[in-house]
């Protein structure tokens, strides 16, 4: 029950996170005009990954896309790439995790396959979250650098008579959305990996190990991780009676890779 809850919660958290990453990527407010020197401006500038916008005090907003690919800063291209990779990995992760959910039965899918899929989606969510956090952090660093550079030469002009104010940009709402969304996706991924550890032994098809006894041979099927942690109902952890006598060496057990996670 706890495994299902952990897996389900991980899925939901990741879903919210990925939705947030998509929203942040599409948002225009990655950087917004710094209003420190002129809090009341009749023209407000803000920029996104794909276009820059100007909002006039009348309410009219005009946006222009970045219609060049080669002319854009390498850092901006890198941020775009990181966010897209994050979205793609997250989307694939969501697709995989839907089929991995314990509460959803799809044909005669092996439980071990579900554990594998849960782990795969978990890793994908973690990488997706890290990509988003990295992308947003790179952009934020770029903003900080540019902010102090533009502060250094804030005013330029002819003998100080005519001033040209260089527009300074500060953190926009999209950065905070991206950081939170990336964090949620990361947490969701970790939860999926934890759920996978709990799922693993239950899905593993172990061969019974027989111990030679003078009377009836009693073979114990180990309950593994699940039995010791109390995750779920351990119905398969029961005694198997076998009349045949075999030595320990003759018996092969097939442990799953998940036993050692």
């Amino acid at each position: 029950m706890a495994v299902t809850a952990c897996q389900g919660l991980g899925f939901v958290v990741s879903l919210i996170g990925i939705a947030g990453i998509i929203a942040a990527t599409c948002m225009d407010q990655w950087s917004t005009q710094d209003l420190y020197n002129n809090p009341v401006t009749a023209v407000f500038n803000y920029q996104g990954l794909w276009r820059s916008c100007v909002r006039e005090s009348s309410g009219f907003t005009e946006c222009r896309g970045y219609f060049t690919l080669l002319g854009l800063p390498a850092m901006l291209q890198a941020v775009r790439a990181l966010m897209i990779v994050g979205i793609v990995l997250g989307a694939i992760g969501l697709l995989v995790s839907i089929f991995a959910l314990k509460c959803i039965r799809i044909g005669s899918m092996e439980d071990s396959a579900k554990a594998n899929m849960t782990l795969t989606s978990g890793i994908m969510f973690i990488v997706s979250g890290l990509c988003a956090i990295a992308g947003v952090s790179v952009f934020a660093n770029m903003l900080v650098t540019n902010f102090w550079m533009s502060t250094a030469n804030m005013y330029t002009g002819m003998g100080g008579m005519v001033q040209t104010v260089q527009t300074r940009y500060t953190f926009g709402a999209a950065l905070f959305v991206g950081w939170v969304a990336g964090g949620l996706t990361l947490i969701g991924g970790v939860m999926m990996c934890i759920a996978c550890r709990g799922l693993a032994p239950e899905e593993t098809n172990y061969k019974a190990v027989s111990y030679h006894a003078s009377g009836h041979s009693v073979a114990y099927k180990p309950g593994g991780f699940k039995a010791s942690t109390g995750f779920g109902s351990n119905t398969k952890n029961k005694k198997i009676y076998d009349g045949g006598a075999r030595t320990e060496d003759e018996v092969q057990s097939y442990p799953s890779k998940h036993d050692y996670v």
């Epitope: 005009q33 002129n38 009341v40 401006t41 009749a42 023209v43 500038n45 803000y46 920029q47 820059s52 916008c53 100007v54 006039e56 005090s57 009348s58 309410g59 009219f60 005009e62 222009r64 005519v162 001033q163 040209t164 104010v165 260089q166 527009t167």
Partner: antibody, heavy 120, light 113 residues
Framework: QVQLQQSGAELAKPGASVKMSCRAS????????MHWIKQRPGQALEWIGY????????EYNQKFKGKATLTADKSSSTAYMQLSSLTSEDSAVYYC?????????????WGQGTSVTVSS | DIVMTQSPSSLSVSAGEKVTMSCKSS????????????LAWYQQKPGQPPKLLIY???TRESGVPDRFTGSGSGTDFTLTISSVQAEDLAVYYC?????????FGAGTKLELK
């Protein structure tokens, strides 16, 4: 067509207050900011401030803070400006002007003006 | 505050003449975000409110005759009347539309010679 109808001329004593109105018609009142401008006889125009009729948010020129108070009544599509503690310096023509949409923050329609005379 | 300086303060012209008046701002009115200039020109006739002629430094307001042309960028702007008509005799104001408080120039008075 768009019209901004301002109230009639005001004669007031020093220290008194006056409240003038600007009634909008021919457009959606709440969709445009309403600005107020002062013009003393033979002098240039001075921006007083604006009101957003939707939110009642106001922004004032520092020079007119405490002197002018801008309000708006959505139900009657009317903007108001109250001038307090009047002095002879406040004798002027006051205009209301609508900030045009897609007009680069320019005022595309103006009222006919309200003349205020401060005299003892 | 942005200071708007207009020159000359008055102009005496004959009908049909070409007229040019200047407006300089103490700070650039060119917005880096959209590369647009936030400057307007108004015409005010005696006893009347100002009338918008040009916005965005060069865009003519609807209904304004094409003899009125706005030009310039950054801090230097010009209003040109290609062929002055009797009805053009008025005071012309330039206005900063970029920064609050919005500020106006002292005006250029166009008179008949």
């Amino acid at each position: 067509q768009v019209q901004l109808q301002q109230s009639g001329a005001e004669l007031a004593k020093p220290g008194a207050s006056v409240k003038m109105s600007c009634r909008a018609s021919g457009y959606t009142f709440t969709s445009y900011l309403m600005h107020w401008i002062k013009q003393r006889p033979g002098q240039a125009l001075e921006w007083i401030g604006y009101i957003n009729p939707t939110t009642d948010y106001t922004e004032y020129n520092q020079k007119f803070k405490g002197k002018a108070t801008l309000t708006a009544d959505k139900s009657s599509s009317t903007a108001y400006m109250q001038l307090s503690s009047l002095t002879s310096e406040d004798s002027a023509v006051y205009y209301c002007g609508r900030l045009g949409y897609y007009k680069r923050n320019a005022m595309d329609h103006w009222g006919q003006g309200t003349s205020v005379t401060v005299s003892s | 505050d942005i200071v708007m300086t207009q020159s000359p303060s008055s102009l005496s012209v004959s009908a049909g003449e070409k007229v040019t008046m200047s407006c300089k701002s103490s700070q650039s009115l060119l917005n880096s975000g959209n590369q647009k200039n936030y400057l307007a020109w108004y015409q005010q006739k005696p006893g009347q409110p100002p009338k918008l002629l040009i916005y965005g430094a060069s865009t003519r307001e609807s209904g304004v005759p094409d003899r009125f042309t706005g030009s310039g960028s950054g801090t230097d702007f010009t209003l040109t009347i290609s062929s002055v008509q009797a009805e053009d005799l008025a005071v012309y104001y330039c206005q900063n539309d970029h920064f609050y408080p919005l500020t106006f120039g002292a005006g250029t008075k166009l008179e008949l010679k």
